[in-house]
Interface confidence: low
């Protein structure tokens, strides 16, 4: 018969024949032959392979380097890599999370729209009319101006995006 040019799923073509791939968590030791099945071996401690494969070496689990502000979020198995995340107050610089940077703070006049996570930075938004922020913070939202009317007071100084309104007593008519 003609040698196969394509193999079924979870197989690979070698020496004009189809061999079984090794399952996740195992590496290839020797290809199949006309008489023998593919030989696979489990990955060692701190190694993994996450797909059906014909790799002769397992990949090393990622090292979450504390020197780079990293810690283990999820320990690796023979089939999965270690997942790193950043220490509190920091977030990853890339999807691979190879290093961390400090969460951004929102400047006065801006409030936090979305608090940072281990993988995404703080999202800031300008305080709209009627709201203010007078601090640089990675947590504080824009606060609404004080309502002088509800306190039976009048506005003495208008608010800005960085300052609250200043309330004062109403001028009273003398008898």
């Amino acid at each position: 018969p003609e040698p196969p040019t394509a193999c079924r799923e979870k197989q690979y073509l070698i020496n004009s024949q189809c061999c079984s791939l090794c399952q996740p968590g195992q590496k290839l030791v020797s290809d199949c032959t006309e008489f023998t099945e593919t030989e696979c071996l489990p990955c060692g401690e701190s190694e993994f392979l996450d797909t059906w494969n014909r790799e002769t070496h397992c990949h090393q689990h990622k090292y979450c380097d504390p020197n780079l502000g990293l810690r283990v979020q999820q320990k690796g198995t023979s089939e999965t890599d270690t997942i790193c995340t950043c220490e509190e107050g920091w977030h990853c610089t890339s999807e691979a999370c190879e290093s961390c940077v400090l969460h951004r703070s929102c400047s006065p006049g801006f409030g936090v729209k979305q608090i940072a996570t281990g993988v995404s930075d703080t999202i800031c938004e300008p305080c709209p009319v009627g709201f203010f922020s007078n601090v640089s913070s990675a947590f504080e939202k824009c606060h609404p101006w004080t309502s002088c009317e509800t306190k039976d007071l009048v506005v003495q100084q208008a608010g800005t995006n960085k300052t609250d309104v200043v309330c004062g007593p109403q001028d009273r008519l003398r008898a």
Epitope: H59, N67, L68
Partner: antibody, heavy 119, light 112 residues
Amino acid sequence: QVQLVQSGAEVKKPGASVKVSCKASGYTFTGYNMNWVRQAPGQGLEWMGNIDPYYGNTNYNQKFKGRVTMTTDTSTSTAYMELRSLRSDDTAVYYCARLGLQLYAMDYWGQGTTVTVSS
Amino acid sequence: DIVMTQTPLSLPVTPGEPASISCRSSQSLVHSNANTYLHWYLQKPGQSPQLLIYKLTNRFFGVPDRFSGSGSGTDFTLKISRVEAEDVGVYYCSQSIHVPWTFGGGTKVEIK
């Protein structure tokens, strides 16, 4: 031992593109980021960016954004750097350099590839 | 971008004598984890750069102990306790704390 072997010298015309390769051996290719650094004649070193071969994520120097593309082929443990719309001031030696994991510095360098841009 | 400024530009040295190169960064290179992401590279004539010192004070494999790095925050120094003829070349400081990573302009060390 760790080795990074780069492709040979290139001569290009302004406006053309160049693709430099860097074949790695002696370590697990997918475990380390690969950087690209260039050096114009008689000048200092300039970092162009890096790529994580495992995920394909890239970090580019804004100066080159839109003109540079970094890729890898994990089956051959090779990193590539393509620079488009070449100008005469792109004439330089281009180096690949591995990023040491715990070092966070470039611990092993290729021999360099000379790219000359001339009409 | 962080600007790295090296002095001197050129340093004529006598074998056996000490030598010192300074590097200043426009921003602090200290991470909250207390590491300083300042490195030193040497480019010998006609060769690729090679790593000498990483993260401020750590000598890379095979680097002789006559090389030492020091400094803090934004001011850094590379010292060679006794210069040897093989130490000639251009020395670069570099930071890897903020993208884009940047290098100093280089200090050319040559024998008097």
